[in-house]
């Protein structure tokens, strides 16, 4: 399995962000596919569970991401993306996307460095 992410993402406090993660695999996508999203905070604290997909999507039942994350992927299109809602400044950090698709071997975990900012920079407004 190979993972592709946007690597770096900047988003405005209070808005929603799509954490994009796509993948390729020599094995066909079926019921064995699993996707696990985790979060490493900037302060170096313990990694946190964000989201899990296996046949169906499953939100965390506890913690800071409870009721703030939803599935925005499509396995048939090799898309394992999620939506993170109501961004807060302490959501700054690294989000990891891990895709397992047996019998294919696990690949390198994809990473997205999220920066939550007060306002979007002018250079980014140009592209919006």
């Amino acid at each position: 399995v190979e993972i592709y992410t946007s690597r770096v993402l900047e988003a405005v406090n209070g808005t929603d962000a799509r954490l994009k993660c796509t993948f390729s695999s020599f094995a066909p996508v079926g019921d064995a596919l699993t996707v696990t999203w985790n979060f490493r905070p900037l302060d170096g604290g313990p990694e946190q569970f964000v989201f899990y997909y296996h046949i169906d999507p499953f939100q965390p039942m506890s913690g800071r991401f409870k009721d703030r994350v939803s599935w925005d992927g499509n396995p048939e299109r090799y898309d394992a993306s999620i939506l993170l809602w109501k961004l807060q400044f302490d959501d700054n950090g690294t989000y990891t996307c891990q895709v397992k698709n047996p019998p294919d071997v696990d690949g390198v975990i994809g990473e997205i460095r999220l920066s939550v900012v007060h306002t979007v920079r002018f250079s980014e407004i140009h592209f919006l």
Partner: antibody
């Protein structure tokens, strides 16, 4: 490194209340929800509830609703679990634990004995 | 609430053996956690969300399953693996634990 240090063992009479403390260090206290799990002697694990240290929001196991109160003191990074109307079947080791990717970090446990 | 039933409740095995513990849920759950507990100690996480190894856990431990049936496998038992193992579901509140599987030296 993450550490959760709990208060010492308690012996209580039936009908009394007990308040167990859990002092956290080595991480940002408000970033991780605190859970309480108990284990009766020789028995399995039972989830009691959780508290969001940021705003004090709680979610209790219905079994303990009305008897359990979880609070935090952000200034000292300490969580508290108070259980009232104690009965003999509440004799157990009470653990505080934080949820990261699982219940990854645990206190050393506090033995609460309820005996007349 | 969802009931979790582990089998077997007791298991005798030797160092080097391959061991599998099963956890069955009373209704479908999305994922499973597994913990190891030694006498007088707090539980230690082994597997989170069904198949992911917790930090520092050796690769001889693995988890799998879906729906109502999940398994924890230890590919080659080591002396330090003799302990009690618990499954835990958290795709429905309240989170619940299995009754435990005590793994003893044969």
């Amino acid at each position: 490194q993450v550490q959760l240090v709990q208060s010492g063992a308690e012996v209580k009479k039936p009908g009394a209340s007990v308040k167990v403390s859990c002092k956290a260090s080595g991480y940002t206290f408000t970033n991780y929800w605190m859970h309480w799990v108990r284990q009766a002697p020789g028995q399995g694990l039972e989830w009691m509830g959780e508290i969001n240290p940021t705003n004090g929001g709680t979610d209790y196991n219905e079994k303990f609703q009305g008897r359990v109160t979880m609070t935090v003191d952000k200034s000292t990074s300490t969580a508290y679990m108070e259980l009232s109307s104690l009965r003999s079947e509440d004799t157990a080791v009470y653990y505080c634990t934080i949820y990261t990717t699982a219940l990854d970090y645990w206190g050393q446990g506090t033995l609460v004995t309820v005996s007349s | 609430q969802i009931q979790l039933t582990q089998s077997p409740s007791f298991l005798s095995a030797s160092v080097g053996d391959r061991v599998t513990i099963t956890c069955r849920a009373s209704s479908s759950v999305g994922y499973m956690y597994w913990y190891q507990q030694k006498p007088g100690k707090a539980p230690k996480p082994l597997i989170y969300v069904t198949s992911n190894l917790a930090s520092g856990v050796p690769s001889r431990f693995s988890g799998s399953g879906s729906g109502t049936e999940y398994t924890l496998t230890i590919s080659s038992l080591q002396p330090e693996d003799f302990a009690t193992y618990y499954c835990q579901q958290w795709s429905s509140n309240p989170p619940t634990f299995g009754q435990g599987t005590k793994l003893e030296i044969k």
